[in-house]
């Protein structure tokens, strides 16, 4: 529990401290205060670097001091023989003695008190971006007119976020443009267009003047465009360094303008408009697109018709064409559908004949029916040769899809009759 | 068959055996058997066999049995109360529609039908083959197939032969242009039990083939001349009957 003051005494003080002791005290004062630790008595066996016996003062990971030997006050009006001032609210004191003492040493007496720290001046890092106000136990930051204190209660910025642009065309500029933009600000602008339209940003080089990058090439003030998982920028410098036309491929764009404490320039101005989302002209083999256009955009519908001998297999039914729509995400609907060669399937069996297994049953393949010779012959002509046609049927040049008919050969005995002589 | 020789079914793969009455027929395609009307008039559900030279019961068990679906007797065939006394064998032709198609092979295949052109008009002396399991010189019924080659003869030769066991006076027997007379050479002739079998003649337009010029019908006396139904005169009826009673599978 934090306290405002306290006393720390070595073991048995004011009697001699025992050998082989290690004792520590954790000092904590309330937040916003520092600690003033002072010793009024110090009588500890002296050794080089206080290696034998010592009292150690530690602040976080830093050793503030290590004491041994005898001390007396330099000031006749003050009993303090040694003191420490830390700007933190926690401190640890550790007393150690080794296994032997040459003489009788009485140890130490120390006191601590909570002291106010001036956060505005006591630290290398200034806690406030603009105005710092110290009070006992803490500090607060404040801002000049037209600035507001950010949620971190330290930084001031202008109120330049929260605008959402939904119109299909518009203009956005940095605060005060073309006057210098405010320092130490983060401005976020959101463009949210109807799905199916991509945000296209256009900038003129001369409409951009933002504090230049440091020697390592890092922008000190920056303009960034974020569209989904794509980022454009950060951009900075005199004259816009990026593409003058940014096609975001997204209907949502976040514009983030981040400034630091120094180097304000005139800023930037941009225009944006919504373009219907383009869909790429995909390479769909063995097919024709109707209508044929150089560029397809959101809501465009094409009929994709398979070339003769090809079909689109959807489920298990073959069709010769399908429709595809350019969707709001820039992708075509039905993109999984493809024109593939028509499969005429296993040829039908015929009675009293056969068909050899074709190498393939796809479009253009050829099969041949034969009759079981010499007992059957092909009655309806056509030669028995069929090819896999574009409509998925096995077709003969003469019979079309009609199957050959194997009919019995008549009047032919397997062996001629020979009369036996009597 | 009188005066004939032993034959193998491979010589006459169209030969059909009827067991009741004991008779013959000719296979003309997968579904149809051609026979004489008098063979089937008394039994409209005949049992038939194909593919066997021998009609021994044990051999028939291994041959192909044909099941009839329907019998079509020529409308010109006169049905009698007492068939035994028949003297008119005009239009002695019938078709048997089979329930299932016959599978063709070396021992089973059809005989052709005659064409309608004059090429298929028979001349006296034209040779034809007859086959069957009917009466021989030695026995009432043959167990193994017999066959003979005999010539076409003028109809008067058949008229001149005295009927062996007449059931009526000689003048009562009817002779028409629907009949072919054949035989009279070396005593070769068809006989009782051969009825319905084909009188097979070499096709004038394709010497490798035989067609059914006639069907064994009747005769005055075995071993002389025999009368055969002239199939050419019935080709239209045969085609029409088959067409009207076929399944799409045959069409």
């Amino acid at each position: 529990e934090p306290t405002m003051y306290g006393e720390i005494l070595s073991p048995n003080y004011p009697q001699a401290y025992p050998s082989e002791v290690e004792k520590s005290w954790d000092i904590e004062v309330p937040e916003g205060y520092g600690i003033h630790l002072y010793f009024t008595h110090l009588d500890i066996e002296l050794s080089e670097n206080c290696a034998y016996d010592s009292v150690q003062i530690i602040s976080g990971d830093t050793e503030e001091g290590r004491l041994c030997g005898q001390r007396s006050s330099n000031n006749p009006h003050s009993p303090i023989v040694e003191e420490f001032q830390v700007p933190y609210n926690k401190l640890q004191v550790i007393f150690k003695s080794d296994f032997s003492n040459e003489e009788r040493f009485t140890g130490f007496a120390a006191y601590y008190v909570a002291t106010d720290i001036n956060e505005c001046t006591d630290f290398v890092d200034v806690p406030c971006s603009h105005f710092c106000n110290n009070f006992i136990g803490g500090y607060f930051c404040s801002c000049p007119p037209e600035y507001f204190l950010h949620d971190d209660m330290k930084n001031c910025g202008v109120n330049c976020s929260g605008d959402v642009f939904t119109a299909l065309i518009g203009e956005i500029a940095s605060p005060n443009y073309p006057k210098p933009y405010p320092e130490n600000s983060r401005c976020e602008y959101q463009i949210r267009l109807e799905k199916g339209f991509q945000v296209v940003v256009t900038l003129r080089r001369e409409d951009f003047d933002v504090e230049a990058a440091d020697s390592a090439g890092n922008c000190l003030d920056s303009l960034v465009f974020v569209a989904g998982d794509r980022q454009f920028g950060p951009y900075c410098g005199h004259g816009f360094p990026g593409p003058l036309n940014i096609e975001t491929k997204s209907n949502a764009l976040d514009i983030i303008f981040q400034t630091d404490l120094t180097g304000q320039k005139k800023g930037w101005k941009l225009r944006y408009h919504g373009d219907p989302m383009p869909c790429p002209k995909e390479d769909t083999p063995n097919s024709v697109w109707e209508p044929a256009k150089a560029k397809y955009v959101f809501r465009d519908v094409v009929q994709i018709t398979c070339l003769d001998g090809f079909e689109v297999v959807e489920g298990r039914v073959g069709a010769t064409s399908f429709y595809s729509t350019c969707q709001s995400n820039g992708k075509w609907s039905n993109s999984k559908l493809k024109c593939q060669p028509v499969d005429c399937g296993i040829p039908e069996s015929i009675e009293n004949g056969k068909v050899e297994d074709p190498e393939s049953t796809l479009f253009g393949s050829v099969i041949r029916y034969t009759c079981e010779e010499p007992y059957y012959y092909m009655e309806n002509g056509g030669g028995g040769e069929y090819h896999c046609a574009g409509n998925g049927s096995w077709v003969n040049e003469v019979l079309g899809p009609e199957l050959p008919k194997c009919v019995p050969v008549c009047g032919v005995p397997r062996e001629p009759f020979e009369e036996k002589q009597r | 068959i009188i005066g004939g020789s032993d034959a193998d079914i491979k010589n006459f793969p169209w030969q059909v055996f009827f067991d009741n009455p004991w008779a013959g027929g000719a296979l003309i395609n997968e579904y149809w058997v051609l026979t004489a009307a008098h063979v089937v008039e008394g039994n409209r559900e005949p049992t038939m066999y194909v593919g066997s030279t021998s009609v021994q019961t044990s051999r028939l068990a291994k041959s192909k049995m044909l099941t009839p679906e329907h019998v079509f007797i020529h409308p010109g065939w006169k049905l009698l109360e007492v068939p035994e006394g028949r003297t008119n064998f005009d239009n002695d032709i019938a078709l048997v529609r089979l329930k299932d198609p016959v599978k063709m092979g070396p021992t089973v295949s059809p005989i052709c039908l005659p064409g309608t052109s004059s090429d298929y008009n028979l001349m006296d002396g034209d040779l034809g083959l007859i086959s069957g399991w009917g009466r021989t010189e030695k026995r009432d019924r043959a167990v193994r197939l017999k066959a003979a080659r005999l010539p076409v003869a003028p109809l008067r030769k058949c008229k001149e032969v005295k009927v062996e066991k007449p059931t009526a006076d000689a003048e009562a027997y009817v002779f028409t242009p629907n009949m072919i007379c054949a035989g009279g050479e070396k005593g070769m002739d068809s006989c009782k039990g051969d009825s319905g079998g084909a009188f097979a003649v070499q096709d004038p337009n394709d010497k490798t083939k035989f067609y059914a010029a006639g069907l064994v019908s009747w005769g005055p006396q075995c071993g002389t001349y025999g009368l055969y139904t002239r199939v050419k005169n019935y080709v239209d009826w045969i085609m029409k009957t088959m067409q009207e009673n076929s399944t799409p599978r045959e069409d």
């Epitope: 298990r316 039914v317 399937g345 069996s349 009675e351 297994d357 049953t361 079981e372 | 799409p248 599978r249």
Partner: antibody
Framework: EVMLVESGGGLVKPGGSLRLSCAAS????????MSWVRQAPGKGLEWVAT????????YYLDSVKGRFTISRDNSKDTLYLQMNSLRAEDTALYYC???????????WGQGTLVTVSS | QIVLTQSPATLSLSPGERATLSCTAS???????LHWYQQKPGKAPKLWIY???NLASGVPSRFSGSGSGTDYTLTISSLQPEDFATYYC??????????FGQGTKLEIK
């Protein structure tokens, strides 16, 4: 007379395998495409697989693809169905059938019962 | 895939009555590739009508089949005791699968 006789069915655990055979006679086996069709107890008919007359083209029901293999040995007039990774839902009476004109199944075997159960 | 729906699922009629069994396809089917089978309990199915209207071997002439496109019918003009069975329609499209209807059970009333 056309005859198809299936064999090889039996009881098998899920994940197990079976090989069904179908012996054909009475027709020229190598001239016909053949199919396997199954019927779960008390249910309707379900086509399983088809093989072309020479055996080089095969087609399967989606749910058996990759698990079942249809094959044939034309020298032995026999059709096969190798069934791997069997599931409870494969339990059925399996018929082999001959494919005729129009892909009608004009002759069927008597069926062989496959039961998949733990 | 093409789905075949048979109706009714069960048909109860008396001998001598006329029976009409329906088979509806989810998309058009070639009449050459639409077939009917008869199955009796404990027996394998038998091809009954092939290519919409052709009677298989041995099927009595009281049976007939008709239809085109998506609607097909099997008709029995006058029911005989041996006709009571389950009837399945079946279609083939060149891209498998073959599909069967769920069956119509024709039972004696």
């Amino acid at each position: 007379e056309v005859m198809l006789v299936e064999s090889g069915g039996g009881l098998v655990k899920p994940g197990g395998s079976l090989r069904l055979s179908c012996a054909a006679s009475g027709f020229t086996f190598s001239n016909y495409a053949m199919s396997w069709v199954r019927q779960a107890p008390g249910k309707g008919l379900e086509w399983v697989a088809t093989i072309s007359s020479g055996g080089s083209h095969t087609y399967y029901l989606d749910s058996v693809k990759g698990r079942f293999t249809i094959s044939r040995d034309n020298s032995k007039d026999t059709l096969y169905l190798q069934m791997n990774s069997l599931r409870a839902e494969d339990t059925a009476l399996y018929y082999c059938a001959r494919l005729f004109t129009g892909y009608a199944m004009d002759y069927w075997g008597q069926g062989t019962l496959v039961t998949v159960s733990s | 895939q093409i789905v075949l729906t048979q109706s009714p699922a069960t048909l109860s009629l008396s001998p001598g009555e006329r029976a009409t069994l329906s088979c509806t396809a989810s998309s058009s089917v070639s009449s050459s590739y639409l077939h009917w089978y008869q199955q009796k309990p404990g027996k394998a199915p038998k091809l009954w009508i092939y290519s919409t209207s052709n009677l298989a071997s041995g099927v009595p002439s009281r049976f007939s089949g008709s239809g085109s496109g998506t609607d097909y019918t099997l008709t029995i003009s006058s029911l005989q005791p041996e006709d009571f069975a389950t009837y399945y329609c079946h279609q083939y499209y060149r891209l498998p699968p073959h599909t069967f209807g769920q069956g119509t059970k024709l039972e004696i009333k």
